[in-house]
């Protein structure tokens, strides 16, 4: 039986029934959030022998292993994944071990096994037997290996039953529990899987199999399955489906969507069968299976049943992700926020049309709308009172509309109203009447001269750079020294740089008020010789990257009682030189003859430059005859020393631990000082933690259905 | 205190182009205002031609606006008015004015054309 | 356009007396955000014109305060308290809702 479109097993252990007769999961399993350790022994569930999705297990109670659950899983497809990994075990508070002595493949995806305070048998499970990479893999904050003593079946009789693997230059045994070994298939079979008596398996056959060299005995599908048998591509009127099966047309057409029942219905495109058309395509039609390219952004339209959507946070903008038309007005109310231009982006940065008015008012956050990155027509079916369909008023911070060099907005109908935005130059107004086409409709009462930009340096002239010097992570720059009309008004420069791939930032790019800025900022004081130019060397920047830098200059002179006076540069991108690349990450090798090496890794995260080559050392080494790093002649005599809590602090260290030379003398020695690189690596991983967690929250923390 | 000093030719010939000048003093032409020109045949009403922002932006009359174009020069912190295809019609008293939110609060001294051949 | 109506055409007044001009408009002055947009300007003979009054009622600077202006919408008037011989001249009207701005034909206030 094929059991779908996920199971969520959550608060009563009893749900487990529910896999009672699955042989697939299509989908995901969840198993979580049972607080009450109960006994699971009586729960058996040996025909599962393949998940699609990921297996997801969060504080389970009273769970001890996996093996005696799932005794037959084999293959954990990943055809989607929880945040990058296909199978997580996280604050189980009770796993001794994961015991899935039949799981032999994790097709896509990686695994998290993190804050298991019991778990043990996690370093002698050779996971490079059953994933493609290990190197996303994530480990951390389980029992010590140390405090588990594990031991593999036979090693205490010193008749040792498991096969021996090298992982991390460690040989050792490699099994899932105390009496289970991890399955090895003869190195004949190559990369194929085999049956239990080490036979090879058919190339289209995935973990194991029943019968040798038989496409119809496989437990689980290499590619495709589809009427009893093992295929490397769905023939011809069949579609693929959940990325490991074949359908028919009416199969896929019969398909109810677990997301909504008023859905569509999935459709057939590029030969898979699939809830909804892929980024960049949309339905041929209302009622169409079949998919074509859209022109530009797919539309997506959003609909707001109280004609108007209030916009006052990151979660309402959240509603509008994805969104291209929106059918009602835009009120946008951001008085605070936290990166809220980048967030705002985000969610509203694919609206390209607005069927009623936009009115933005009292968003203090506010720096820019250039987070409506495609608005490009608000259409004014309904307008505020006195017919407008773009109203701004009291934004304080406001100072940027849209670039207009790169954008076309149309307004159809209605006019634009501007009162009260103390930073926004009129002139800028008075440019996108012109664009959007509003010119003449607005009365002089609806752009107010007075009390628009009267806090901004509306007037601004243009500061030029007069040379750029640049190394492998440092730019000198100079300007022209600015002579505002009352030198004395003149106060310092600030310098603004970011990194900038392409050449298409502007000022206002990821800015808010409250704070959130994508350029970094420096102060330049004015060079005490009237005769030297101004500038600035910035360092501790990265090799062979391109950045934006502009320069604003810091004035007081007024115009008039009622404006200042400013200058800035333009906008000057310059690249930093080459420098020597990072070191290639993920190197592996593996024997593959008595006399060949096979060695693969990837590029370096830094390449600091254009690659050309790579230079590939290598040395003979003395064979280590040290393979054994514990001797344990008992298990009941592995010292135990702390229960493992299953946080992920670093242990403490009681004294100082004797070290070889140091200092040129003998005797105990402190551990070195981190380095920053290394300190900067501990903060990175906890932020990560961190950001995994939130996710999981996120996902299966939901409210309980009415 | 702004003032406003215009200057231009006092005599055009028909279907020429009248040319004027307004300097502003004072203060700034890039100051949140708007620069107009007002014309009064003799004896008669003013009439508004059109106007200018420093940025460039305008407003014309559509009665004329096929024949005006004003500019603005913001080095020498002046706006000029060029009015194509003069006839009779177009002798007048010409002046630039400046206009806040709060009204036409500056004026010129006003310049008089005289379209004749 | 806006087509603005002016009257009397012309006013003769006493010296110390008060006198009132009033000003119609084809459509409504008054703007969403309260404010009357007509303003009143005086030109003296042989002079450039001056601005008296602003957004319907508000004295420019410098201005006496025996003008005063009022009315909205479509009705306005300027009134002088107690006319002095300083205050002879035309007076204009002129609405400043929309381009083009337009002015009203003109009254020509002289001293009996």
């Known amino acids: 039986e094929i059991c779908g479109p996920g199971i969520d097993i959550r608060n009563d252990y009893q749900q487990l029934k529910r896999l009672e007769n699955c042989t697939v999961i299509e989908g995901y399993l969840h198993i979580l959030l049972i607080s009450k350790a109960e006994d699971y022994r009586s729960y058996r569930f040996p025909k599962l022998t393949v998940i699609t999705e990921y297996l997801l297990l969060f504080r389970v109670a009273g769970l001890e292993s996996l093996g005696d659950l799932f005794p037959n899983l084999t293959v954990i497809r990943g055809w989607k994944l929880f945040y990058n990994y296909a199978l997580v075990i996280f604050e189980m508070t009770n796993l001794k071990d994961i015991g899935l002595y039949n799981l032999r493949n994790i097709t896509r995806g990686a695994i998290r096994i993190e804050k298991n305070a019991d778990l043990c048998y996690l370093s002698t499970v050779d996971w490079s037997l059953i994933l493609d990479a290990v190197s996303n893999n994530y480990i951390v904050g389980n029992k010590p290996p140390k405090e588990c003593g594990d031991l593999c079946p036979g090693t205490m009789e010193e008749k040792p039953m498991c096969e021996k693997t090298t992982i991390n230059n460690e040989y050792n045994y490699r099994c899932w529990t105390t009496n289970r070994c991890q399955k090895m298939c003869p190195s004949t079979c190559g990369k194929r899987a085999c049956t239990e008596n080490n036979e090879c398996c058919h190339p289209e056959c995935l973990g194991s199999c029943s019968a040798p060299d038989n496409d119809t005995a496989c437990v689980a599908c290499r590619h495709y399955y589809y009427a009893g048998v093992c295929v490397p591509a769905c023939p011809p009127n069949t579609y693929r489906f959940e990325g490991w099966r074949c359908v028919d047309r009416d199969f896929c057409a019969n398909i109810l969507s677990a997301e909504s029942s008023d859905s569509e219905g999935f459709v057939i495109h590029d030969g898979e069968c699939m809830q909804e058309c892929p980024s960049g395509f949309i339905r041929n039609g209302s009622q169409s299976m079949y998919c074509i390219p859209c022109e530009g952004p797919c539309p997506k339209v959003c609909e707001e049943e109280k004609k108007t959507k209030t916009i006052d946070s990151v979660t309402s903008a959240q509603m509008l992700q994805g969104c291209t038309i929106f059918k009602g007005n835009l009120l946008i109310n951001i008085r605070r926020g936290n990166n809220i231009a980048s967030e705002l982006e985000n969610f509203m940065g694919l609206i390209e049309v607005v069927t009623g008015y936009v009115k933005i008012r009292h968003s203090h956050a506010l720096v820019s709308l250039s987070f409506l990155k495609n608005l490009r027509l608000i259409l004014g079916e309904e307008q505020l009172e006195g017919n407008y369909s773009f109203y701004v008023l009291d934004n304080q911070n406001l100072q940027q509309l849209w670039d207009w060099d790169h954008r076309n907005l149309t307004i159809k109908a209605g006019k634009m109203y501007f009162a009260f935005n103390p930073k926004l130059c009129v002139s800028e107004i008075y440019r996108m009447e012109e664009v959007t086409g509003t010119k003449g409709r607005q009365s002089k009462g609806d752009i107010n001269t007075r009390n628009n930009g009267e806090r901004a340096s509306c007037e601004s002239d243009v500061l030029h750079f007069t040379s750029t010097t640049t190394s492998k992570n440092r730019i000198i720059i100079t300007w022209h020294r600015y002579r505002p009309p009352d030198y004395r008004d003149l106060i310092s420069f600030t310098v603004y740089y970011k990194e900038a791939p392409f050449k298409n930032v502007t000022e206002y790019d990821g800015q808010d008020a409250c704070g959130s800025n994508s350029w970094n900022m420096v102060d330049v004081d004015l060079p005490p010789n009237k005769d030297v130019e101004p500038g600035i060397l910035l360092h501790g920047l990265k090799p062979w990257t391109q950045y934006a830098v502009y320069v604003k200059a810091v004035t007081l002179t007024m115009v008039e009682n009622d404006h200042i006076r400013g200058a800035k540069s333009e906008i000057l991108y310059i690249r930093t030189n080459a420098s020597v690349p990072s070191i290639p990450l993920d190197v592996l090798s593996a024997s593959n003859s008595s006399s060949q090496l096979i060695v693969k890794w990837n590029p370096p995260s830094l390449p600091n430059g254009n690659l050309s080559y790579y230079i590939v050392r290598w040395q003979r080494q003395p064979q280590d005859g040290y393979l054994y790093r514990h001797n344990y002649c008992s298990k009941d005599k592995i010292p135990i020393r702390k229960y493992a809590d299953g946080t992920i602090d670093i242990e403490e260290v009681t004294e100082n631990p004797k070290t070889e030379v140091c200092g040129g003398e003998k005797g105990p020695c402190c551990a070195c000082p981190k380095t920053e690189a290394e300190k900067q690596a501990e903060k990175e991983e906890a932020e990560y933690r961190k950001v995994f967690e939130n996710f999981l929250h996120n996902s299966i923390f939901v409210p309980r259905p009415e | 205190q702004v003032q406003l000093q215009q200057w231009g030719p006092g005599l055009v010939k028909p279907s020429g182009t009248l040319s004027l000048t307004c300097a502003v003093s004072?203060?700034?032409?890039?100051?949140?205002?708007?620069w107009s020109w007002v014309r009064q045949p003799p004896g008669k009403g003013l009439e508004w031609i059109g106007e200018i922002y420093h940025s460039g932006s305008t407003n014309y009359n559509p009665s004329l606006e096929s024949r005006v174009t004003i500019s603005v020069d913001k080095s020498k912190n002046q706006f000029s008015l060029k009015l194509s295809s003069v006839t009779a019609a177009d002798t007048a008293v010409y002046y630039c004015a400046r206009d806040r939110y709060y009204g036409m609060d500056v004026w010129g001294q006003g310049t008089t054309v005289t379209v004749s051949s | 356009d806006v087509v603005m109506t002016q009257s009397p055409l012309s006013l003769p007044v006493t010296p110390g007396e008060p006198a009132s001009i009033s000003c119609r408009s084809s459509?409504?002055?008054?703007?969403?955000?309260?404010?009357?947009?007509l303003d009143w300007y005086l030109q003296k003979p042989g002079q450039s014109p001056q601005l008296l009054i602003y957004l319907g009622s508000n004295r420019a600077s410098g201005v006496p305060d025996r003008f005063s202006g009022s009315g909205s919408g479509t009705d306005f008037t300027l009134k002088i308290s107690r006319v002095e011989a300083e205050d002879v001249g035309v007076y204009y009207c002129?609405?400043?809702?929309?381009?083009?701005?337009?002015f009203g034909g003109g009254t020509k206030v002289e001293i009996k």
């Open positions: 004072g203060g700034s032409i890039s100051s949140s205002n708007w």
């Open positions: 459509q409504s002055l008054l703007h969403s955000n309260g404010y009357n947009y």
């Open positions: 002129m609405q400043a809702l929309q381009t083009p701005l337009t």
